[in-house]
């Protein structure tokens, strides 16, 4: 397993509709054709997997149908969007990138993006 640098923004504020987007960029040391991206959430010293997708370079990221994540890739950048967030989902969201194929296998873990989600003030038909 070889290390790889992964960069992501320090802080993102979710929209009032509970949507947060951020870019996860990795320094690919080779010509990977298969990449796996995983979003982890760290809160109260617990780390949980939020979503994951494997994609072939040049193709779209494919998350599971019921995933709260969507994403697109462009070169060594992955644009991630997480939806359905509410205040209790505030936490550190860590981007983990694995270059699966061809060998050698590379692993990179970002420092995390602190996503802040605010419960909006009550008003007619507002989003929670």
């Amino acid at each position: 397993c070889k290390a790889m640098h992964v960069a992501q923004p320090a802080v993102v504020l979710a929209s009032s509709r509970g949507i947060a987007s951020f870019v996860c960029e990795y320094a690919s040391p080779g010509k990977a054709t298969e990449v796996r991206v995983t979003v982890l959430r760290q809160a109260d010293s617990q780390v949980t997997e939020v979503c994951a997708a494997t994609y072939m370079m040049g193709n779209e990221l494919t998350f599971l149908d019921d995933s709260i994540c969507t994403g697109t890739s462009s070169g060594n950048q992955v644009n991630l969007t997480i939806q359905g967030l509410r205040a209790m989902d505030t936490g550190l969201y860590i981007c983990k990138v694995e270059l699966m194929y061809p060998p050698p296998y590379y692993l990179g873990i970002g420092n995390g993006t602190q996503i802040y989600v605010i419960d909006p003030e009550p008003c007619p038909d507002s989003d929670f």
């Epitope: 509970g18 939020v50 709260i68 939806q83 359905g84 509410r86 989902d89 507002s126 989003d127």
Partner: antibody, heavy 123, light 107 residues
Framework: QVQLVQSGAEVKKPGASVKVSCKAS????????MHWVRQAPGQGLEWMGI????????NYAQKFQGRVTMTSDTSTSTVYMGLNSLRSEDTAVYYC????????????????WGQGTLVTVSS | DIQLTQSPSSLSASVGDRVTITCRVS??????LNWYRQKPGDVPELLIY???NFQSGVPSRFSGSGSGTDFTLTISSLQPEDVATYYC?????????FGQGTKLEIK
């Protein structure tokens, strides 16, 4: 085990107010949102609002704005739903139901419901 | 407001039949849809969350599918205890609207 225990049935006159309680146990109270849903006799389910027990933040269905108040008491792990200016069409069974953050592992929204509280509004 | 329209509003089927209930949403809600069963006189029980996830303890004859605006609840082999009213509900954000319900009876 997880339990949501609601207060007993109420009979109220039109124009009066009612306050229904929902006491939670068996899980971390402040880690889940709580919803209130009502069901008039022979009718479908109607979402009323949501409260964040940790912060007290609320959001109400437009239909109930100005008439409903949802609060929480973390010391007793209880949420309350108050409805004022009662009318006959408010006669219904009122339910509380918990809802985890979306990122909670194996967390399912509305997985546990209270047993329901019948509120009858009649002159 | 976002509307949820269930169809049919009622249906009668025989034990062992495959039953399908649909829920159409007026706006894209991704996969943020729940399905509930409410037996007569009972509290609603969660069957499926986020379109296709089984709630623990729910019989495997129940399954959910769909994304965006069109969702389906399928009962692969109808059982007598499935006599109930079924509701869909959006869980994306407030308001967490329910469909009007589908009443299922046994022939």
């Amino acid at each position: 085990q997880v339990q949501l225990v609601q207060s007993g049935a109420e009979v109220k006159k039109p124009g009066a107010s009612v306050k229904v309680s929902c006491k939670a146990s068996g899980y971390t109270f402040t880690s889940y949102y709580m919803h209130w849903v009502r069901q008039a006799p022979g009718q479908g389910l109607e979402w009323m609002g949501i409260v964040n027990p940790s912060s007290g933040s609320t959001n109400y269905a437009q239909k109930f704005q100005g008439r409903v108040t949802m609060t929480s008491d973390t010391s007793t792990s209880t949420v309350y739903m108050g409805l004022n200016s009662l009318r006959s069409e408010d006669t219904a069974v009122y339910y509380c139901a918990r809802d985890p953050p979306i990122t909670m592992v194996r967390g399912a929204p509305f997985d546990y419901w209270g047993q329901g509280t019948l509120v009858t509004v009649s002159s | 407001d976002i509307q949820l329209t269930q169809s049919p509003s009622s249906l009668s089927a025989s034990v062992g039949d495959r039953v399908t209930i649909t829920c159409r949403v007026s706006q894209d809600i991704s996969s943020f849809l729940n399905w509930y069963r409410q037996k007569p006189g009972d509290v609603p029980e969660l069957l499926i969350y986020r379109s296709s996830n089984f709630q623990s303890g729910v019989p495997s004859r129940f399954s959910g599918s769909g994304s965006g605006t069109d969702f389906t609840l399928t009962i692969s082999s109808l059982q007598p205890e499935d006599v109930a009213t079924y509701y869909c509900q959006r869980t994306y954000n407030a308001p967490y609207t329910f469909g009007q319900g589908t009443k299922l009876e046994i022939k």
